[in-house]
């Protein structure tokens, strides 16, 4: 299920119109598209241009992160007069052109979404040959990837004075709430660290001091679901064994 956020203040879409008496380029992209991890999403992009009946060579490009300089994730090229835009680049084979650039449509389908795909994407078209022009969406479309929680790491670590602490890291969007439960704990939201820089979907919770042997369970929950994982603490002869 894919949701396209409509921004009524921008005439339903982010429409970038750049015109003068001799030229008129515009690109229409929605501000945001939402989809769940594992699903597919469509990034809509249509354009108008000042070159009437252009049928020369063209290249369609999508890039991620920032306009003009972000890494390309998709590129295809159409020869003069051809309606077929032959894919030259599709990152991890997950990007596919849905639109027909000859009909001013650069819409892109992204398969098997992952949280790492949650970023801004920019469509671009280049005309080559007799007419020599190019244009790129500067605002782009934000792909918002949602995901049920997944615990990516749970561990017991030594800490000073022969004590032990437990760490639980989970990912999800919205970022999940983490809770620890275990011997003499009840439910604890112990020391949740906010998402790390550059890892916006990761949340870590720490239990700073494990005072009893037994099973400690970390639960991650958001609006899309919950996940849990456990570690076991057994202390003997001043050492510990922990398993998950």
């Amino acid at each position: 299920f894919v949701r396209t956020k409509i921004d009524t203040t921008e005439n339903l879409l982010n429409t970038e119109v750049h015109s003068s008496p001799a030229q008129r380029w515009s690109m229409q992209v929605p501000p945001e598209v939402s989809a769940e991890a594992g699903d597919a999403a469509v990034l809509p992009c249509t354009f108008t241009h000042p070159h009437r009946h252009y049928d020369g060579p063209l290249t369609a490009i999508w890039r991620a992160g920032e306009p003009y300089a972000g890494p390309q994730v998709f590129r295809c090229a159409a020869a003069r007069g051809s309606e077929l835009c032959q894919t030259a680049l599709s990152l991890h084979g997950r990007f596919r052109l849905l639109g027909n650039p000859r009909r001013n449509d650069l819409s892109l389908r992204v398969e098997r979404l992952a949280l790492a795909d949650d970023r801004r994407y920019f469509c671009r078209v280049e005309f080559a040959g007799d007419v020599h022009d190019r244009y790129e969406s500067r605002h782009g479309v934000r792909l918002h990837v949602t995901a049920a929680p997944r615990i990516v790491n749970i561990s017991v670590l030594p800490s000073p004075a022969h004590a032990f602490r437990a760490l639980c890291t989970a990912e999800g969007e919205p970022p999940p709430a983490l809770a620890w439960s275990g011997p003499a704990l009840g439910n604890s939201l112990a020391a949740v660290r906010s998402p790390r820089e550059g890892h916006g979907h990761l949340v870590t919770a720490e239990l700073p001091a494990l005072t009893h042997d037994g099973r400690y369970t970390c639960t991650a929950a958001n609006s899309l679901g919950r996940s849990e994982a456990s570690v076991y603490l057994f202390r003997f002869h001043g050492a510990s064994g922990a398993s998950t």
Partner: antibody, heavy 118, light 112 residues
Framework: EVQLVESDGGLVQPGRSLKLSCAAS????????LAWVRQAPTKGLEWVAS????????YYRDSVKGRFTISRDNAKSTLSLQMDSLRSEDTATYYC???????????WGQGTLVTVSS | DIVMTQTPLSLSVTPGASASISCRSS???????????VFWYLQKPGRSPRLLIY???NLASGVPDRFRGSGSETDFTLKISRVEAEDVGIYYC?????????FGSGTKLEIK
């Protein structure tokens, strides 16, 4: 680190041919247009030719059209310039450059001198 | 062809002073709002050219903020504040709006 390294140029007689090549590293080669820019001794910069991502589209300045051929090998990350029917006015240092449309000629090779003389 | 006209041809500057180079194009280099295809390059003696400024006013990677580009449409300026000895060389403006891509004839900066 982005690097562009041109092959050696040399002395060539008028009417003869020479092929220049440029080895690129440090970036995703096929994501960029590439170009050759030349500079005659004690003169300014003069764009020669550009080639598109897959090498489908080439652009040339009028004075070299029909004589020079720009090409690329994305598998080997190399750019080439085949120069035929060379003239004395083609004498110059030839630079290969990465052409970032909105970012200019962002990176340049060290240049290689081509001298056309009898 | 778009002609890029640079002035002055040369200038001699005292270290610490500022320098200004002008570039005029024979046609507007404005493609669309916020997108003007003019660039500045520096070629130090015996070296390859190096990108200084892209799209009128954006500093290329590693370029000190003593360099500042400005202008619009057909008139562009490169200003160097607090000139240093390492700034000597030939400065070129260039355009990537239309084929053939063209450069100015260059401005030679010397230190007094």
């Amino acid at each position: 680190e982005v690097q562009l390294v041109e092959s050696d140029g040399g002395l060539v007689q008028p009417g003869r041919s020479l092929k220049l090549s440029c080895a690129a590293s440090g970036f995703t080669f096929s994501d960029y247009y590439l170009a050759w820019v030349r500079q005659a001794p004690t003169k300014g910069l003069e764009w020669v030719a550009s080639v598109s991502y897959e090498g489908i589209t080439n652009y040339y300045r009028d004075s070299v059209k029909g004589r020079f051929t720009i090409s690329r090998d994305n598998a080997k990350s190399t750019l080439s310039l085949q120069m035929d029917s060379l003239r004395s006015e083609d004498t110059a240092t030839y630079y290969c450059a990465r052409q970032d449309w909105e970012g200019g000629f962002a990176y340049w090779g060290q240049g290689t001198l081509v001298t056309v003389s009898s | 062809d778009i002609v890029m006209t640079q002035t002055p041809l040369s200038l001699s500057v005292t270290p610490g002073a500022s320098a200004s180079i002008s570039c005029r194009s024979s046609k507007s280099l404005l493609h669309s709002p916020g997108l003007t295809y003019v660039f500045w390059y520096l070629q130090k003696p015996g070296r390859s050219p190096r990108l200084l400024i892209y799209r009128v006013s954006n500093l290329a990677s590693g370029v000190p903020d003593r360099f500042r580009g400005s202008g619009s449409e057909t008139d562009f300026t490169l200003k160097i504040s607090r000139v240093e000895a390492e700034d000597v060389g030939i400065y070129y403006c260039g355009q990537l709006l239309e084929n053939p891509f063209t450069f100015g004839s260059g401005t030679k900066l010397e230190i007094k």
